[in-house]
């Protein structure tokens, strides 16, 4: 086991594409660096013009690369992916019962919006009420990876602090990743101040995402509890009767 609860699992035989996806026959991990814990992880992707289309592709590659390093299943790590601009567009929901490879494919096809603004407050409101409105897996850690590169107008951030308080009440951890010179440092610092687990990562640009990926995964993996060991099927007693 790697430090920080990152498990190097045995490699499973690949599941053929014609077989219907069954949770107990997961796809093999693609990397040695691998997190297998109880975690509900939400990726929030800034869809503003502050990231160019090429930069947004790098951001998506980071999300997909992170997903490759997670043991995604309904019993271990569930993921949701939301692109946000002045509204929010959910591409993946926590309860989606799809193969990890299919989830990664969907994440890789998120459309670039390049809108004038991306409202952190609106996407946090969406996450608080739509994604974590009902906690259906209390035993799992709940983590939001907020990938932000822009500032919203102050009027849109009117209830920002209220949403942070809502996450604190629901024990949802926020990890802001500030990308580039236009990320809202004031909001990022406020997120950090809200709870000790809310650690921020400040990056000079999208090119740093790959360099810092393992550090970020390590941190969020450390926040989650271990998954219980799979229960073994009961042994069938073999009774041998000696000839009389």
């Amino acid at each position: 086991q790697e430090p920080g609860g990152l498990v190097v699992p045995p490699t499973d035989a690949p599941v053929s594409s014609t077989t219907p996806y069954v949770e107990d026959t997961p796809e093999p991990p693609l990397h040695n660096f691998y997190c297998s814990k109880l975690l509900d992880l939400v990726f929030l992707l800034d869809g503003s013009y502050r990231l160019s289309e090429a930069e947004f592709e790098v951001l998506k590659a980071f999300v997909v690369g992170t997903m490759e390093r997670l043991h995604i299943s309904q019993k271990r790590i569930r993921v949701a992916v939301v692109e946000y601009h002045d509204g929010s567009h959910a591409y993946l929901e926590l309860r989606a019962r799809k193969r990890p490879s299919e989830l990664r494919r969907i994440a890789s096809q998120i459309k670039y919006v390049g809108s004038q603004l991306a409202s952190t407050s609106e996407v946090l409101k969406y996450t608080l009420f739509q994604i974590f409105g009902k906690i259906d897996r209390p035993e799992a850690s709940r983590v939001i990876l907020l990938l932000t590169a822009s500032q919203e107008p102050q009027r849109m951030a009117r209830y920002f602090t209220r949403y942070l308080q809502g996450f604190k009440k629901k024990k949802v951890i926020l990890i802001p990743v500030g990308i580039g010179p236009h990320a809202n440092l004031k909001q990022i610092r406020l997120i950090e101040k809200q709870a000790p687990e809310n650690k921020a990562f400040l990056l000079s640009g999208v090119d740093e995402l790959e360099q810092r990926r393992d550090e970020i995964i390590n941190y969020l993996c450390d926040l989650a509890p271990e998954a219980p060991a799979p229960s073994k099927p009961p042994q069938v007693a073999h009774i041998t009767v000696s000839p009389g």
Epitope: P153, Q154, M156, A157, F160, R162, K186, Q187, L190
Partner: antibody, heavy 122, light 107 residues
Framework: QVQLKESGPGLVAPSQSLSITCTVS????????VDWVRQPPGKGLEWLGM???????DYNSALKSRLSITKDNSKSQVFLKMNSLQTDDTARYYC????????????????WGQGTSVTVSS | DIQMTQSPSSLSASLGDRVTISCSAS??????LNWYQQKPDGAVKLLIF???SLHSGVPSRFSGSGSGTDYSLTISNLEPEDIATYYC?????????FGGGTKLEVK
């Protein structure tokens, strides 16, 4: 210390527009919001709208179509413009400092100007 | 819009009295309530923000309480300079709205 001072025309003819200037001192308009509140004679207070430190604005939806709030940070001035005035717009108009910010959710109107009286009459 | 209703609309009390003014919201405002004092000359001051936090420079005889839809302002020991009209204001949702006011007079 924090001060806000409104200056207006006093008298406005019906259907005309109203312009009031609020000059502030003791704080920066980039760090604080400024709200506008009015009070018709013998009545209660009504919130009209506000301008944030970054220049974004919020308006009372009942008045939004005829209201505009702008500012000049360098002159420490905030401007209220209201179109198509009617007699029921007769009121004392206050500008008020608002500590609204990303980190503040207690939108208390903490320092008020003395107000300027506006009468709409022909 | 959220409606704010104050009671009583006017109140007569003696100096040294304990005075309570009530404010009711048309929906839960989650303690997002402020209290203001308006003197007869029209000057307005913030007294209390977020239901019970005293604004700087406000005497400790003023206190606020409440939750949900029901809130109150209490003046524990009425002084001559407290003669004014008092307003509550919600900031749960835009537009911010005020109560109709409570005019406090001395007997």
């Amino acid at each position: 210390q924090v001060q806000l001072k409104e200056s207006g025309p006093g008298l406005v003819a019906p259907s005309q527009s109203l312009s009031i200037t609020c000059t502030v001192s003791g704080f920066s308009l980039t760090d604080y919001g400024v709200d506008w509140v009015r009070q018709p004679p013998g009545k209660g207070l009504e919130w009209l709208g506000m301008i944030w430190g970054d220049g974004s604005t919020d308006y009372n939806s009942a008045l939004k179509s005829r209201l505009s709030i702008t500012k000049d940070n360098s002159k420490s001035q905030v401007f209220l413009k209201m179109n198509s005035l009617q007699t029921d717009d007769t009121a004392r108009y206050y500008c008020v400092r608002d500590p609204a910010d990303y980190g503040n959710y207690d939108y208390a109107l903490d320092y008020w100007g003395q107000g300027t009286s506006v009468t709409v009459s022909s | 819009d959220i409606q704010m209703t104050q009671s009583p609309s006017s109140l007569s009390a003696s100096l040294g009295d304990r005075v309570t003014i009530s404010c009711s919201a048309s929906q839960d405002i989650n303690k997002y309530l402020n209290w203001y004092q308006q003197k007869p000359d029209g000057a307005v001051k913030l007294l209390i923000f977020y239901t019970s936090s005293l604004h700087s420079g406000v005497p400790s005889r003023f206190s606020g309480s409440g939750s949900g839809t029901d809130y109150s302002l209490t003046i524990s020991n009425l002084e001559p300079e407290d003669i004014a009209t008092y307003y509550c204001q919600q900031y749960e949702k835009l537009p911010w709205t005020f109560g109709g006011g409570t005019k406090l007079e001395v007997k």
